[in-house]
């Protein structure tokens, strides 16, 4: 490693690497400063002058220490089936997640590219597996002795009420009807709901731009010696 008082730009000692938050500029053959998140390289370093950084313009960002010539463009505005869980700033991209009642059918590194409505189980079917942020509801036919009379993405099959005298037997989509004024007991007097999946975004991660939107991924390597600059209803 270079002497502790080395200021950028400096020539690294043979076999050594540049320090963290620095990169090796092949043209200058010097270790030079990276730009901090929210900035980009306006002027690359030379043998005698360090990198000149500038703030990202509106609707663009950099999330990492970098030496990209231009900031990355923030993603497009969230669609109507999404909510913006992170705004576009100079240091972070916009993140869109699915709104309640929807799940992410096609995800990206952070947030969701394509949302789809959660399947609704029709009468005679109940929720076997609830929907999550990234998976749809799975429905199953109500087993004998249970029913569901709703079209719902959260209701499970409920037991038929127990009658002293049955007026109308229950089936998969209808509860039993009793002749007496009240049943001896009701296994499930109210609708049973499964919790709706809540769209959340992972905390304290610092996502990197997708390769398709970044000049290259080399500037994303935090510990590198900094190689050259990039770049339904139914069942």
């Amino acid at each position: 490693l270079p002497a502790q008082v080395a200021f950028t730009p400096y020539a690294p000692e043979p076999g050594s690497t540049c320090r963290l938050r620095e990169y090796y500029d092949q043209t200058a053959q010097m270790c030079c400063s990276k730009c901090s998140p929210g900035q980009h390289a306006k002027v690359f370093c030379t043998k005698t002058s360090d990198t000149v950084c500038d703030s990202c313009e509106d609707s663009t960002y950099t999330q990492l220490w970098n030496w990209v010539p231009e900031c990355l463009s923030c993603g497009s505005r969230c669609s109507s089936d999404q909510v913006e869980t992170q705004a576009c700033t100079r240091e972070q991209n916009r993140i869109c997640t699915c709104r309640p009642g929807w799940y992410c059918a096609l995800s990206k590194q952070e947030g969701c590219r394509l949302c789809a409505p959660l399947r609704k189980c029709r009468p005679g079917f109940g929720v076997a597996r609830p929907g999550t942020e990234t998976s749809d509801v799975v429905c199953k036919p109500c087993a004998p002795g249970t029913f569901s009379n709703t079209t719902s993405s959260t209701d499970i099959c409920r037991p038929h009420q127990i009658c002293n005298v049955v007026a109308i037997p229950g089936n998969a989509s209808m509860d039993a009807v009793c002749t007496s004024t009240s049943p001896t007991r009701s296994m499930a007097p109210g609708a049973v709901h499964l919790p709706q999946p809540v769209s959340t975004r992972s905390q304290h991660t610092q996502p990197t731009p997708e390769p398709s939107t970044a000049p290259s991924t080399s500037f994303l390597l935090p510990m590198g010696p900094s190689p050259p600059a990039e770049g339904s209803t139914g069942d």
């Epitope: 963290l20 998140p37 991924t217 390597l221 510990m223």
Partner: antibody, heavy 119, light 107 residues
Framework: QVQLLESGGGLVQPGGSLRLSCAAS????????MSWVRQAPGKGLEWVSG????????FYADSVKGRFTISRDNSKNTLYLQMNSLRAEDTAVYYC????????????WGQGTLVTVSS | DIQMTQSPSSLSASVGDRVTITCQAS??????LNWYQQKPGKAPKLLIY???TLQTGVPSRFSGSGSGTDFTFTISSLQPEDIATYYC?????????FGQGTKVEIK
């Protein structure tokens, strides 16, 4: 959720070898540099090795240089540490840790795997 | 390599007390200092990075300050769940290095 799970620790004789693995889930593994940090029984934390997000650049503490090799398989979301010529002083809990790309601290840690080097 | 010196090595305080730990670097590390909490038998947890930035989800009673070579970590009102060993770590350059740790106990 974001998780790191180490495996491969155990008892080994001096001079022997072990390979540690760290399975990552819940985040874009290929976008993050990763590290191994160890902690000898009753002692403090010691950084052992690091690897860049793409795997092209590797770094080692002087105490393990030439004996340990860090690698990663981004297709399997797995980090490795091949440990050869093990010594008694390598006895420690080995943690796999994700490198925070802004601060270069370690923001996600595994639960650790114990490596005991003893005859 | 950059040496990190933490003090004290251990301390005992009462619930509600203000607790301060210091960390000194052997050379200028600017603001690139991180603080971790490690409870017995558990992995360390990042509390503060870049000297003073609180990691997401960390209670606001934890704070950090300093730059250059001298840094301070503070628990404004010690809670029973704060019993742990706290480590500083410099991330100015590789190899990243840790302080020796400060064990915090309840009186």
């Amino acid at each position: 959720q974001v998780q790191l799970l180490e495996s491969g620790g155990g008892l080994v004789q001096p001079g022997g070898s072990l390979r540690l693995s760290c399975a990552a889930s819940g985040f874009s593994f290929s976008s993050y540099a990763m590290s191994w940090v160890r902690q000898a029984p009753g002692k403090g934390l010691e950084w052992v090795s690091g690897i860049s997000a793409g795997g092209g650049e590797t770094f080692y503490a002087d105490s393990v240089k030439g004996r340990f090799t860090i690698s990663r398989d981004n297709s399997k979301n797995t980090l490795y540490l091949q440990m050869n010529s093990l010594r008694a002083e390598d006895t420690a809990v080995y943690y796999c840790a994700r490198v925070h790309p802004i601060s270069y601290g370690f923001d996600i840690w595994g639960q650790g795997t114990l490596v005991t080097v003893s005859s | 390599d950059i040496q990190m010196t933490q003090s004290p090595s251990s301390l005992s305080a009462s619930v509600g007390d203000r607790v301060t730990i210091t960390c000194q670097a052997s050379q200028d590390i600017k603001k690139y200092l991180n603080w971790y909490q490690q409870k017995p038998g558990k992995a360390p947890k990042l509390l503060i990075y870049d000297a003073s930035t609180l990691q997401t989800g960390v209670p606001s009673r934890f704070s950090g300050s300093g730059s250059g070579t001298d840094f301070t970590f503070t628990i404004s009102s010690l809670q029973p769940e704060d019993i742990a060993t706290y480590y500083c770590q410099q991330s100015d350059n590789t190899p990243v290095t840790f302080g020796q740790g400060t064990k915090v106990e309840i009186k």
